[in-house]
């Protein structure tokens, strides 16, 4: 049993039939000594009297708000959660496993550029009694400060039948050096509590593999006279880490016809224009990766040829 | 070239250099990233790589300062690394084609490296390991996890340089 | 903390095969090196084989080659250990263990030198 | 194969005494990837030095290793009640990774 927080205690259980549970032992945070009576969550039952209360966890019957009285006045609680440990595996029955970029994925990230600051996002299908922490930091065994914020409702979606949640929180690095190269990684810790269940998540990476550009910014097409090409060109993004001369990227322009089936004609380039052939009906797109780390490209900017 | 004095460095021949190394660290392991190769460190874990950290002057405003500092780790780095790729964890069973792009990085690191370094200078460098692995197999993981960290070195490297050759040279 | 949690003794024929089981939880799996073991009763300790699962490809003991299979489940995180045409003589407890860490440079790979063990299971092979 | 030849196969000591275990490998050892286990009835090996001499995480300071080549040494320089078991030494420098066969050390 540990402290999640103050009056907030997780007990780790061994989950399998007939298992022994945990031997627990409640104390009154009370100066008083006698006619202490204990009850669990709004019953009225008397579960024990005295100072201290112990008793066997075995099963989410067995959780909840422990509270000790003396004639009628609350003294104080004990809130008791469960994190189940089966066939030597953390349950992780709260998120959901978004399977990329492999399995057993729940905690996903993403960084704009590299000022230090990053979201991360998870999935859930699970609508009520949800809470969610997140704590952060660089490097583990001396660690340096990341500050995150509240996790937040940030997307509902309909899969099938059924509704999923996504929720997301923005974390910053205390002392960010976007120029240094990483070498302890950034670590995400979640802890979820649904009802009386406890789990936690974590994800580790550095930020150099979690940078996803914006989309490139202004693309415009300026024609070739009597040519069917035309000169496209686009800006940084404004999100994107200064000054460009050292936090390059570099680009994709594809040409793509109206129909899915015809060809894709595609140019990179480190410049931030291109010259290529519209076709009717085509549509020019350009996106963004870092110029020198293959992390992510940006999601598409696009215009159309006519 | 780097000369201790101070002078600069042939910022736009390092730059096209050092975005070659960039893309033949990548080709010569492209799906490293999707690998778990993360690092656990114990009580006996010591970490000898040279990395460019944030004191080492690389950021925009250390160069226009003095590229010195910047210049002398990145070369370090590179001796390193040339060292590593010459070592037999790249040398050794499971063989590489000659062709390969570890090949042509491992020279490239080398060209680099002196165009940095003038004869008869010599900043000091970091020593690899003498331990060396006995199965294929640790040396197979070791070449992942060195090439990514490889990777990430030189990305910072390639900025320095392209920065340097947009407002730095003369 | 770190542990190896193997399955259950088994009781087996003959001629049958037995498939031993070992969950990791915490640490790194993919790039451990995890090793089976043997101990037949009141003999010495025999290395079977082993296998990195971020590689899938596992290494035997030739005295085992053909007759031992080593897999594992990244997603899991368990290793697998399976010996078919089981004779009396495999009768042992069968550990399962994982490599400890060297370091190379600032790059840590694993030894063959086993610091964490499972519980062992113990297999017999009786008619 | 390389064999380890572990000797004596038992040694009957009392608490306080220093042992001396020996390990002889039938070729050379390379880079010194020798290990040395102790092991418990009913209990699963536990690693006390790997790399010949190095002392593995909370291994306590009477235990030590030395040599190199084919010859290995595994020394407790007093013993402790705890330090009565079985020994083996590991060579991890060609497959298949093996074992000598024991050194039991027992209570005199």
């Known amino acids: 049993i540990w402290e999640l927080k103050k009056d907030v205690y997780v007990v780790e259980l061994d989950w399998y039939p007939d298992a022994p549970g945990e031997m627990v032992v409640l104390t009154c945070d009370t100066p008083e000594e006698d006619g202490i009576t204990w009850t669990l969550d709004q019953s009225s039952e008397v579960l024990g009297s005295g100072k201290t209360l112990t008793i066997q966890v075995k099963e989410f019957g067995d959780a909840g708000q422990y509270t000790c009285h003396k004639g009628g006045e609350v003294l104080s609680h004990s809130l008791l959660l469960l994190h189940k440990k089966e066939d030597g595996i953390w349950s992780t029955d709260i998120l959901k496993d978004q399977k990329e970029p492999k399995n057993k994925t729940f905690l996903r990230c993403e960084a704009k550029n590299y000022s230090g600051r990053f979201t991360c996002w998870w999935l859930t299908t699970i609508s009520t009694d949800l809470t969610f922490s997140v704590k952060s930091s660089r490097g583990s065994s001396d660690p340096q400060g990341v500050t995150c914020g509240a996790a937040t409702l940030s997307a509902e979606r309909v899969r099938g039948d059924n509704k999923e949640y996504e929720y997301s929180v923005e974390c910053q690095e205390d002392s960010a050096c976007p120029a240094a190269e990483e070498s302890l990684p950034i670590e995400v810790m979640v802890d979820a509590v649904h009802k009386l269940k406890y789990e936690n998540y974590t994800s580790s990476f550095f930020i150099r593999d979690i940078i996803k550009p914006d989309p490139p910014k202004n693309l415009q097409l300026k024609p070739l006279k009597n040519s069917r090409q035309v000169e496209v060109s686009w800006e940084y993004p404004d999100t994107w880490s200064t000054p460009h001369s050292y936090f390059s990227l570099t680009f994709c322009v594809q040409v793509q016809g109206k129909s899915k089936r015809e060809k894709k004609d595609r140019v990179f380039t480190d410049k931030t224009s291109a010259t290529v052939i519209c076709r009717k009906n085509a549509s020019i797109s350009v996106r963004a990766q870092d110029r020198y780390y293959s992390s992510s490209w940006s999601e598409w900017a696009s215009v159309p040829c006519s | 070239r780097a000369v201790p004095g101070g002078s600069s460095p042939a910022w736009t021949q390092c730059q096209q250099l050092s975005q070659k190394l960039c893309t033949l660290a990548w080709s010569a392991h492209p799906l490293v990233g999707h690998m778990d190769l993360r690092e656990e460190g114990d009580e006996e874990t010591t970490n000898d790589v040279p990395h460019i950290q944030c004191g080492d002057g690389c950021d925009p405003q250390g160069l226009r300062d003095n590229s010195q500092f910047c210049l002398q780790r990145i070369h370090q780095g590179l001796i390193f690394y040339e060292k590593l790729l010459g070592s037999d964890i790249f040398t050794g069973e499971p063989s590489l084609l000659p062709d390969s792009p570890v090949a042509q990085l491992h020279a490239s690191l080398l060209g680099l490296s002196q165009l940095l370094q003038p004869e008869g200078h010599h900043w000091e460098t970091q020593q690899i390991p003498s331990l060396s692995p006995s199965q294929p197999w640790q040396r197979l993981l070791l070449r992942f996890k060195i090439l990514r960290s490889l990777q990430a070195f030189v990305a910072v490297a390639a900025r320095v340089f392209a920065h340097g050759a947009a407002t730095l040279s003369p | 903390q770190v542990e190896l949690v193997q399955s259950g003794a088994e009781v087996k024929k003959p001629g049958s095969s037995v498939k031993v089981s070992c969950k990791a939880s915490?640490?790194?799996?993919?790039?451990?090196?995890i090793s089976w073991v043997r101990q037949a009763p009141g003999q010495g300790l025999e290395w079977m084989g082993g296998?990195?699962?971020?590689?899938?490809?596992?290494n035997y003991a030739q005295k085992f080659q053909g007759r031992v299979t080593i897999t594992a489940d990244e997603s899991t995180s368990t290793a697998y250990m399976e010996l078919s045409s089981l004779r009396s003589e495999d009768t042992a407890v069968y550990y399962c263990?994982?490599?400890?860490?060297?370091?190379?440079?600032?790059?840590?790979?694993?030894?063959?030198?086993?610091?964490?063990w499972g519980q062992g299971t113990l297999v017999t092979v009786s008619s | 194969d390389i064999v380890l030849t572990q000797s004596p196969a038992t040694l009957s000591l009392s608490p306080g005494e220093r042992a001396t275990l020996s390990c002889r490998a039938s070729?050379?050892?390379?880079?010194?990837?020798l290990a040395w286990y102790q092991q418990k009835p009913g209990q699963a090996p536990r690693l006390l030095i790997y790399?010949?001499?190095r002392r593995a995480t909370g291994v306590p300071a009477r235990f030590s290793g030395s040599g190199s080549g084919t010859d290995f040494t595994l020394t407790i320089s007093s013993l402790e009640p705890e330090d009565f078991a079985t020994y083996y030494c590991?060579?991890?420098?060609?497959?298949?990774?093996?074992f000598g066969q024991g050194t039991k050390v027992e209570i005199k």
């Open positions: 590991q060579q991890t420098s060609n497959t298949p990774f093996t």
């Open positions: 263990a994982r490599s400890k860490k060297g370091m190379y440079g600032g790059w840590t790979y694993p030894l063959m030198m086993f610091d964490l």
């Open positions: 296998i990195i699962p971020i590689f899938g490809h596992a």
């Open positions: 790399y010949a001499s």
């Open positions: 915490g640490g790194t799996f993919s790039s451990n090196y």
């Open positions: 070729q050379s050892v390379s880079s010194n990837y």
